[in-house]
């Protein structure tokens, strides 16, 4: 071409009719005018659909690729059963990496880039309808859904997309039910759906399969009041529409079937991308024909990337953008409602949000009020945990009933049968057996069931844990264990147990208002202060006692000798007086001991001057010894008490852990989480982690057996234990104040009523009564200010 001639860029198209080919040529002319054609001139080359795949592939080669087309537009074939007519176009052009722009093709398979590697489209796939369903769920606050999908690529794609969206909202379908495409019997599947709590049914199926589902649903009375049917476009088209129930909500892609509008927008996108592409360097021309040509178009992948990143704001069909799969983003849908066999637009999805027109909607059963979306199951699965005094677990009698017992008030203890592992000790085989549960939480459950009109079956948590998030197989994925895990997985509908309300749990489940306010405290063994019989020896060391004992006898002997042999001893003032006898050895002993033990000596004192001097020195020494001993004895008796009790969470023995002082809590409990989360308690946590117990009962026993010096746990439980087991005592101030709440899933229909019922129970004194009955009654004398007593131990 001459230097001043524009570059000719051929654009190919496979369209439904000659009329559409004419529209395509007009759109190309419009694009040339819009961009100015002095540099680049677009040229339209088109064919209509061929009756079979081989002819279609040949036509693409002979009529389009031979013209060196930069891109090929392809509409969906007019025959509804000939689903894969764009496939030969996609395969043939894709082989050479020539981008293909689908105009009205909605099947999700075309999003698979490993199969359709050069395919983009100006419409979204059917699976993207999941985004609209998800948004409708949000707008109408429907959290309980049943997903009914055909077990084919389309159904699985819709399911995957919806599940991903639900996961982001930390939610999930109550049940996903799959059926084989073309099946004629879905009754059993729908029967299963009917048993569930959810009443919002989302259906993804072909026209014919949808018709089968609707017929079966009508027979099972699943299309009347209370139900919601959310479907896509295929499910309210053709044969499906004949059987669809009134009140169904379906979707229609706005301009979805408007081939001429999509031709216009696709040409606009291609024109914009061509101009962008040709500004880049090293652009090669597309292949000319297929015969003998196996080389890909080198610039093809680059052109596809340019197309995919295009933003065409002023399209006839709205804003045209593509996602990473080449599918149209921000598509607009009409929300259609079947009323009296007619489809009525009752809302819009504008690419991001649903704008409903509630005035126009008629719900199944002719209702004008939005259905709740669930039926409240009145039989609830309750999970609990053995934790006295909140939940006692005892074996059943031989006849399978529970032994009759009475509370401290003389009322019969209310017991319920609860199934659960018969032994929680590690290593022993665990069998699920019926047992008897009773206690604070069981009384509360019975009260709630009565006021809120539900029945229940109680089971003990299988792993014996309250619930923490743990990594799965060292991956980054975390899963809840314990009662939390059972609630979230649907094995339980409600946790009725002393479950601590904390932020981490509250992100995933709904807590009721607290039924018990408490905190953490520390349980230690009560050391009764005792003094042993030999404690009077303690003020002096044994060497000193030995020296004192020796001194007594040495002094006595010295006195005896001095008194016996001193020449002064014989000096008489008055010779008439009878001569006094010198000290005998025994009286010298008597004198020596007497002085030491401070007894008044009436006779047998030394007579000689020298002996008396020694006696005075000894008396002085004795006075010092006795005074020292007395003072020390008093001090020792005062100090002869056990090591000072833990003062609280800030006690140095806790803050500076050592193996001499072992403290712990229960593994994977809220206390465990608390210590793990608090940075300033990290040293404590590292110590505790090594010593934590499987259950509170085991830890309490360990304290009693002196294997554990301190057990950190819920104050309500520990205060109760200390009041029952007289060798235990709680110590220190409460810390990490919290409460126990009843746990429910976020979407639980019971959550408001449970909280209201608990608040009423606080107001009317019921909780106070439970507290008196189960938690606050005393078995032990709580006073611990007795003086040290002497014992024979």
């Amino acid at each position: 071409r001459a230097a001043c001639d524009p570059k000719i860029v051929n654009i190919g198209a496979v369209l439904s009719t000659r009329k559409h080919e004419q529209m395509f040529r007009e759109a190309v002319n419009q694009a040339n005018k819009r961009h100015g054609s002095w540099k680049i001139q677009l040229n339209a080359t088109s064919v209509t659909h061929k009756p079979n795949a081989i002819q279609m592939a040949l036509s693409v080669c002979e009529d389009l690729i031979s013209s060196q087309v930069y891109a090929i537009l392809v509409s969906h074939p007019p025959t509804p059963n000939d689903h894969f007519t764009p496939t030969p176009v996609s395969y043939t052009a894709g082989f050479y990496r020539i981008p293909v722009l689908g105009l009205t093709t909605r099947m999700s398979i075309y999003s698979d880039k490993s199969i359709h590697l050069s395919f983009l489209r100006t419409v979204p796939p059917y699976s993207h309808q999941s985004s609209v369903w998800f948004e409708m769920m949000r707008v109408y606050s429907w959290n309980h859904i049943i997903l009914l999908v055909s077990d084919d690529h389309e159904g699985r794609a819709a399911q995957k997309r919806l599940e991903t969206l639900l996961e982001e909202r930390e939610s999930k379908a109550e049940k996903v039910l799959q059926f084989d495409p073309g099946t004629k019997n879905v009754t059993a599947l729908l029967m299963e759906a009917k048993e569930l709590e959810a009443r919002v049914i989302i259906l993804s199926a072909s026209e014919d399969d949808a018709a089968t589902v609707y017929r079966a649903a009508a027979m099972l009375n699943m299309t009347g009041s209370g139900y919601v049917w959310l479907v896509g476009e295929r499910e309210i088209s053709g044969n499906a529409l004949r059987y669809a129930p009134d009140g169904i909500l379906g979707l229609q892609l706005i301009n979805g079937k408007n081939e001429s509008a999509h031709i216009s927008d696709a040409v606009g996108v291609v024109a914009q991308a061509v101009h962008e592409l040709l500004e880049k360097e090293n652009i090669t021309d597309p292949p000319r024909g297929c015969v003998g040509n196996t080389n890909i178009w080198k610039t093809g992948p680059l052109f596809k990337r340019v197309l995919m990143s295009s933003k065409y704001a002023d399209g006839v069909t709205g804003r045209v953008e593509f996602n990473e799969d080449g599918d149209r983003k921000f598509a607009n849908y009409s929300i259609m409602n079947l009323q009296n066999r007619k489809l009525v637009q009752v809302g819009i999805y504008n690419g991001t949000h649903v704008i409903p027109n509630d005035r126009k909607i008629i719900w199944p059963g002719g209702e004008t009020e939005k259905p709740r979306g669930y039926q409240m199951s009145t039989r609830l699965k309750i999970v609990t945990i053995h934790q006295e005094p909140f939940v006692y677990v005892k074996p059943t009698l031989s006849d399978g009933t529970c032994k009759e017992e009475f509370t401290v008030n003389g009322d019969p203890v209310k017991k319920v049968i609860c199934t659960g592992p018969n032994d929680t000790s590690p290593g022993s085989p665990r069998h699920t057996v019926p047992q008897c549960c009773y206690g604070f939480c069981i009384d509360l459950l019975i009260k709630l069931a009565r006021t809120m009109n539900f029945t229940y079956e109680v089971h003990l948590v299988a792993d014996g844990k309250f619930g923490t998030q743990e990594r799965v197989n060292n991956s980054n994925k975390k899963e809840w264990n314990g009662m939390m895990g059972e609630l979230l997985s649907g094995q339980a509908d409600m946790i009725v147990a002393p479950l601590t309300i904390n932020n981490e749990r509250a992100q995933y489940i709904e807590f009721s208002k607290p039924f018990k306010y408490q905190g953490l405290t520390i349980l230690v063994k009560k050391e009764i202060p005792r003094s042993t019989l030999d404690s009077f020896m303690q003020p002096f060391q044994s060497t000193l006692w030995l020296l004192v004992g020796l001194s007594v006898h040495v002094v006595a002997v010295m006195l005896y000798l001095l008194d016996r042999f001193s020449p002064f001893g014989r000096f008489k003032v008055n010779s008439e007086e009878e001569e006094e006898d010198a000290l005998t050895l025994s009286s010298a002993m008597w004198f020596s001991w007497g002085v030491l033990l401070n007894s008044g000596i009436g006779e047998g004192a030394p007579r000689s001057f020298s002996a008396r001097i020694l006696g005075m020195v000894w008396a002085g020494f004795a006075m010092i010894i006795v005074a020292s001993y007395t003072a020390n004895l008093a001090a020792f008796l005062v100090l002869d008490r056990p090591e000072e009790r833990i003062t609280g969470i800030n006690d140095p023995r806790l803050r500076n852990p050592s193996d001499k002082f072992i403290y712990a809590t229960v593994k994977q409990s809220s206390v465990d989480i608390y210590f793990r989360r608090q940075v300033e308690l990290s040293t404590m946590y590292r110590h505790m982690e090594k010593h934590n117990y499987e259950s509170a009962a085991e830890a309490i026993q360990a304290v009693r057996d002196n294997k554990l010096h301190a057990f950190i746990w819920d104050s309500a439980v520990l205060e109760f234990e200390a009041s029952q087991k007289c060798d235990l005592v709680t110590t220190g101030e409460l810390f990490f104040r919290s409460g126990f709440g009843i746990g429910m899933r976020k979407d639980s229909p019971w959550k408001q009523n449970v909280s209201l019922s608990i608040l009423k129970s606080h107001e009317n004194g019921f909780m106070e009564d439970l507290d008196k009955t189960w938690v606050r009654y005393q078995e032990c004398d709580s006073r611990s200010n007795a003086p040290a007593t002497l014992t024979f131990e």
Partner: antibody, heavy 119, light 107 residues
Framework: QVQLQESGPGLVKPSQTLSLTCSVT?????????WHWIRQPPGKGLEWIAY???????DSNPSLKNRVTISRDTSKNQFSLKLSSVTAADTAVYYC????????????WGQGTLVTVSS | DIQMTQSPSSLSASVGDRVTITCRPS??????LAWYQQKPGKAPKLLVY???NLADGVPSRFSGSGSGTDYTLTISSLQPEDIATYYC?????????FGQGTKLEIK
């Protein structure tokens, strides 16, 4: 062919109740569609008053709500409008019309009846 | 309530002229709009529904377009029998409201 025909007194005294009836021929009012009353004061624009649906449910303009009663007589294939406590401002041509709710439009209209409120 | 602002309120055009009447709702009505023609002393007659669809029996010179909050009724070639008042009306929310009307006259 569907036809709608309004009937009722042409003159109503202030504070009294205006009563109008729309007779429908060529289509059963219980089969489908929404059946409306619309009015047009002399020389002014159109104002929607109320509708009754094929299933008997109804709705009316909030600005008139506490004065409007809409009902139907299925045996005569008629629907009626009662507007209480009328004033001179209620003087208008009253039309009945059929709404094709699927296409969101009034596709059939009666020829209208003028009601004057005056003492 | 959604307010419907119609413009112009009146216009004069010659036979064969292209005439456009616009209607602007106070909020998005998502193409839930109808156009009516009312001749003096007569009931209104449906011309266009759902913003762009021509009602049965309406001449093809009438067309509707628009979306969101901007709608247009176009008469491609004005005929003498088109002399009337034209009303737009939304059906999105309750209550459905009408524009104040555009009176079309022949020059």
């Amino acid at each position: 062919q569907v036809q709608l025909q309004e009937s009722g007194p042409g003159l109503v005294k202030p504070s009294q109740t205006l009563s109008l009836t729309c007779s429908v021929t060529g289509y059963s009012i219980t089969s489908d569609y929404y059946w409306h009353w619309i009015r047009q004061p002399p020389g002014k624009g159109l104002e929607w008053i109320a509708y009754i649906r094929y299933d008997g449910r109804n709705d009316s303009n909030p600005s008139l709500k506490n004065r409007v009663t809409i009902s139907r007589d299925t045996s005569k294939n008629q629907f009626s409008l009662k507007l209480s406590s009328v004033t001179a401002a209620d003087t208008a041509v009253y039309y009945c019309a059929r709404e094709d709710y699927a296409s969101s439009s009034f596709d059939y209209w009666g020829q209208g009846t003028l009601v004057t409120v005056s003492s | 309530d959604i307010q419907m602002t119609q413009s112009p309120s009146s216009l004069s055009a010659s036979v064969g002229d292209r005439v456009t009447i616009t209607c602007r709702p106070s909020e998005n009505i998502y193409s839930n709009l109808a156009w009516y023609q009312q001749k003096p002393g007569k009931a209104p007659k449906l011309l266009v529904y759902a913003a762009t669809n021509l009602a049965d029996g309406v001449p093809s010179r009438f067309s509707g377009s628009g979306s969101g909050t901007d709608y247009t009724l176009t008469i491609s070639s004005l005929q003498p029998e088109d002399i009337a008042t034209y009303y737009c009306q939304h059906f999105w929310d309750s209550p459905p409201t009408f524009g104040q009307g555009t009176k079309l006259e022949i020059k």
